[in-house]
């Protein structure tokens, strides 16, 4: 085959080698880009700048070689369009700094970085990390600071991330109450903070104030629904980024659900409660107290981890005609209490029938509350014979 | 698999107390009752009472109402009993067993109380 | 409490014989169930829910009753069923258990 005349070659089925002096001096317009899966550069010295535009439509890049050229500044962004990138060789151009965004959300099994004259800085305090663990190839390289020495000797006593403190109300919240959280952000070399709220939604009407280093927030007009909803402040350095989640509890009375029993390995009656704060249970049988036993107790579903519901059953691991009749739950908390109840009918009575009668020998319980009286299908259901004797 | 780890013996004096563990391990500890049944010297089974370390709720054997004491630490998914004013009549196996839906499922080894002077 | 009385405290049987063991309650129970024991072990659960055998329980044993009667029956004695089993209720508290049947090999 004729030499390629080329700035950048095919090389393999998705890989493009650009090394002719001088040829590039940006990444556009690479020739079959969304394909490629290997680029390799070399010798591009008017090649200086990385850029998100650099690599946009290189969705399928894995491996990315770019050495002995002019590279000075690879943006914080710049591989944001090739998530799959799992190889970076930078090495021998003219680095002095590669910020922690740059690989932040990449899964780099290599990062070369030799070569460069890099600047011993808190901005690379995350290099230096990777190199104490091992990550990314990166030991080997016994990477060297410009005129300092080596990375692995750099001071990073003062090189931590921003430290955050949310304040939140002490005080009871109540349903249409406004709060205001601050978010006090310290630390050196601050660029920029924020909130995440995605989990808001419609809990609240949400307004921001202020700036590096306080944050503020109102909540104002609160719904019950902002209970287990993380509210997240978050600060970035040239080191890192920190995150804070903090959660306001918006107090609301207790409520409660019962549902008809089913059998789930054995007997449920199924019960669903809220408030905040969480309502202690009880539950009463045709009006009496009801001790829990290791044969009927109440068992809790996992709760979701973003709402005040629990959902859970009242268990009757053998209940028999004996456990026949009225469930009633009572639920209560500091603002309110609530209560449900339910009919259940597990067995008919082996002991209530006419001698006339013909003698049942398997049942099918029924359980009915206020709106329904569907029959409940009974699997596994023991035959039960009584014999009688009539004098 | 699921285990109930109990010492193997207790030498106690007339008069004193003992407290049993029962280590559980190879499932969920809060999710099942704990039992605890004794069985004296060729003798038959005793149930002395059970707790649920969900939400710590205790059932006891009337018989051992004023002696017996259940308790569980979550963190370490061991479950104790405690029994005091100890007699030579209370020497004897001591098993803990767990339930959830269906009884005592799975056994301890069993703790040898003896209760001598 | 519930009292359970088992039939009979002692027996034997010779390998291939059926064996029937009974557990009487004083008051009625929805279920009854059985533990194996054998000498210096733990209770094995062996029946529960008056009929359903435990994992690993062998097909020749059954159980069956109702009310205040309840039985365990082995179809053909073998060497390895040899054992005390308790009878057990589960629908009041104290649990309580009956004082065993030891059934010996002839």
């Known amino acids: 085959a004729a030499p390629c005349p080329d700035a950048c070659c095919p090389h393999g089925s998705s890989g493009l080698r650009c090394t002719r002096d001088g040829a590039l001096d940006s990444l556009h317009h690479l020739p079959g880009a969304e394909n490629l899966t290997e680029l390799y550069i070399e010798n591009q010295q008017h090649l200086q700048h990385l850029e998100l535009r650099d690599l946009r439509g290189l969705g399928e890049l894995r491996n990315l070689t770019i050495v002995k050229s002019g590279l000075r500044f690879v943006a914080p962004d710049a591989f944001h369009f090739t998530p799959r990138l799992s190889r970076l060789n930078l090495s021998f151009n003219a680095l002095e700094s590669l910020s922690w965004k740059t690989v932040q959300g990449l899964s780099l099994q290599e990062l070369v970085l030799s070569g460069n004259p890099l600047h011993c800085s808190c901005a690379l305090r995350w290099l230096q990390r990777w190199e104490e663990e091992g990550l990314g190839g990166v030991p080997e390289q016994k990477l060297q600071c410009h005129g300092q020495g080596p990375l692995a000797h750099m001071p990073n006593a003062s090189c931590g991330v921003p430290t955050l403190k949310v304040q939140v109300p002490n005080a009871s919240v109540d349903v249409g109450d406004d709060v205001l959280l601050r978010c006090q952000v310290e630390g050196r070399g601050l660029e920029q903070a924020g909130w995440i709220l995605t989990e808001l939604e419609q809990s609240a009407t949400v307004m921001k104030s202020g700036g590096l280093p306080s944050l503020g927030l109102t909540l104002a007009n609160v719904t019950s629904d902002l209970n287990r909803k993380n509210v997240t402040c978050w600060a970035e350095n040239d080191v890192g980024r920190a995150e804070v989640s903090v959660q306001v509890n918006v107090s609301f009375p207790a409520s409660v659900q019962l549902h008809t029993a089913v059998e789930m390995h054995h007997w449920c009656i199924p019960f669903s409660v809220d408030g905040q704060p969480a309502p202690s249970l009880r539950w009463l049988f045709n009006g009496s107290v009801l001790n829990e036993t290791s044969f009927i107790f109440t068992e809790f579903l996992e709760p979701a981890a973003n709402e005040t519901v629990r959902h859970g059953c009242l268990r009757l691991n053998q209940p028999t005609h004996v456990n026949n009749g009225n469930y009633t739950l009572l639920a209560a908390n500091p603002f309110g209490q609530a209560s449900a109840s339910i009919m259940a009918a597990f067995m008919d009575n082996p002991f209530e029938f006419n001698p006339e009668d013909p003698i049942p020998v398997s049942f099918s319980p029924v359980d009915t509350n206020s709106t329904s009286g569907d029959p409940v299908e009974k699997k596994d259901e023991t035959p039960f014979g009584v014999s009688v004797a009539v004098g | 698999q699921v285990q109930l780890q109990q010492p193997g013996a207790e030498l106690v004096k007339p008069g004193a107390s003992v407290k049993l563990s029962c280590k559980s391990s190879?499932?969920?500890?809060?999710?099942?009752?704990m039992h605890w049944v004794r069985q004296r010297p060729g003798q038959g089974l005793e149930w002395i009472g059970e707790i649920y370390p969900n939400n710590g709720r205790v059932n006891y054997n009337e018989k051992f109402k004023n002696r017996a004491t259940l308790t569980v630490d979550i963190s370490s998914s061991t479950a104790y009993m405690q029994l005091s004013s100890l007699t030579s009549e209370d020497s004897a196996v001591y098993y803990c067993a767990r339930s959830r839906y269906d009884p005592m499922e799975d056994w301890g080894q069993g703790t040898s109380v003896t209760v001598s002077s | 409490q519930v009292v359970l009385t088992q039939s009979p405290a002692i027996m034997s049987a010779s390998p291939g014989e059926k064996v029937t063991m009974t557990c009487s309650a004083s008051s009625s129970v929805g279920y009854m169930h059985w533990y194996q024991q054998k000498s210096g072990t733990s209770p094995k659960r062996w029946i529960y829910?008056?009929?359903k055998l435990a994992s690993g329980v062998p097909t020749r044993f059954s159980g069956s009753g109702s009310g205040t009667s309840y039985s365990l029956t082995i179809s053909s004695m073998e060497a390895e069923d040899a054992a005390t089993y308790f009878c057990?209720?589960?629908?009041?508290?104290?649990?309580?258990f009956g004082s065993g049947t030891r059934l010996e090999i002839k």
């Open positions: 190879g499932y969920t500890f809060t999710n099942y009752w």
């Open positions: 829910d008056t009929s």
């Open positions: 057990q209720q589960w629908s009041s508290i104290p649990l309580t």
